[in-house]
């Protein structure tokens, strides 16, 4: 039985050229996190493996920084970065939990953060 929930930063916005932290948190479960995958659509951004550490996809190696924690910092944002991002938690024995973040990259100098929300 999967009892955990993923809390994410929800819908967020950031300025073009700036950076943003993508963050998820798994709670309400004692399952062991073995790996967290960060994806945009079906495209890999990065993996944080409990034993092996971080692997950054070639497509993002010049502008993704690991962390903080299991999160991901996306730098030098462009409008093409607008879209859905997923944190996929591989856990034992529960299985896989997925959280969703929607990022909007704005041309303007005003970028407001959305509210946090949960995905069971």
């Amino acid at each position: 039985m999967m009892t955990g929930t993923i809390e994410t930063t929800g819908n967020i916005s950031a300025e073009k050229g700036g950076s943003i932290i993508l963050q998820c948190h798994l709670s309400s479960t004692t399952a062991q996190v073995t790996q967290v995958n960060w994806e945009q659509q079906d495209q890999l951004l990065a993996i944080c493996n409990a034993d092996l550490g971080w692997h950054i996809s070639p497509s993002f190696k010049d502008r993704v920084a690991p962390g903080p924690g299991l999160g991901l910092t996306l730098q030098s944002l462009t409008v093409n970065d607008t879209g859905e991002y997923f944190c996929i938690y591989h856990t034992y024995p529960d299985g896989t939990y997925t959280g969703r973040i929607f990022l909007e990259v704005l041309e303007s100098s005003v970028a407001e953060h959305g509210a946090r929300f949960q995905i069971p």
Epitope: Q35, N37, I47, P58
Partner: antibody, heavy 120, light 107 residues
Framework: QVQLQQSGGELMKPGASVKISCKAT????????IEWVKQRPGHGLEWIGE????????YYNEKFKGKATFTADKSSNTAYMQLSSLTSEDSAVYYC?????????????WGQGTTLTVSS | DIQMTQTTSSLSASLGDRVTISCSAS??????LNWYQQKPDGTVKLLIY???SLHSGVPSRFSGSGSGTDYSLTISNLEPEDIATYYC?????????FGGGTKLEIK
């Protein structure tokens, strides 16, 4: 020493599916990506995609989505690639290769290749 | 996708020669380039990664250089076992793509 041993050549009929294997020895199987590469005469080498055997995380070249499916069996240190709905365009030599986990973006050891012939 | 072009598909040289194989990318790839050797029997080996780093066990007569869109592999003193096809591959972003290969033959 690191070795990748691939299954033998296959002669398949159009429309069928085939599963090619790649057995890894000489290193910790779960800790490295297995890459799959296609080689057709006159078409050079084409990257199909990759799987991280420890978690089963797999990523595909857009061109091969729906055609190739990767799996891995940690108990036998073997990676598999299934190709479906075969056509003559799938006739090729297929290679598996190793890419170390982390920021190592090169295929440092290769299998000997598996020749697939699709013919009615 | 980034296109990798090896304009010379085949090259003939004499033993002891210095041979240079070139590769160009359709856009800048920031030195994110590898070179592989494929022997006539199909065996593939990594030679050079990140433009100029020699993979372990590869003879020092192999070297790589380049920047931006243009890269090259040099064999300083051609030996019989170097008869093979050589491929460049970028890893600037996915999908990885390879050049069409340069087949090296002995005169």
């Amino acid at each position: 020493q690191v070795q990748l041993q691939q299954s033998g050549g296959e002669l398949m009929k159009p429309g069928a599916s085939v599963k090619i294997s790649c057995k890894a020895t000489g290193y910790t199987f779960s800790n490295c990506w297995i890459e799959w590469v296609k080689q057709r005469p006159g078409h050079g080498l084409e990257w199909i995609g990759e799987i991280l055997p420890g978690s089963g995380s797999a990523y595909y070249n857009e061109k091969f989505k729906g055609k190739a499916t990767f799996t891995a069996d940690k108990s036998s240190n073997t990676a598999y690639m299934q190709l479906s709905s075969l056509t003559s365009e799938d006739s090729a030599v297929y290679y598996c290769a190793r890419q170390k986990y982390g920021n190592y973006y090169y295929f440092d050891y290769w299998g000997q290749g598996t020749t697939l012939t699709v013919s009615s | 996708d980034i296109q990798m072009t090896q304009t010379t598909s085949s090259l003939s040289a004499s033993l002891g020669d210095r041979v240079t194989i070139s590769c160009s990318a359709s856009q800048g790839i920031s030195n994110y380039l590898n070179w592989y050797q494929q022997k006539p029997d199909g065996t593939v080996k990594l030679l050079i990664y990140y433009t100029s780093s020699l993979h372990s066990g590869v003879p020092s007569r192999f070297s790589g250089s380049g920047s931006g869109t243009d890269y090259s592999l040099t064999i300083s003193n051609l030996e019989p076992e170097d008869i093979a096809t050589y491929y460049c591959q970028h890893y600037s972003k996915l999908p990885y793509t390879f050049g069409g290969g340069t087949k090296l033959e002995i005169k």
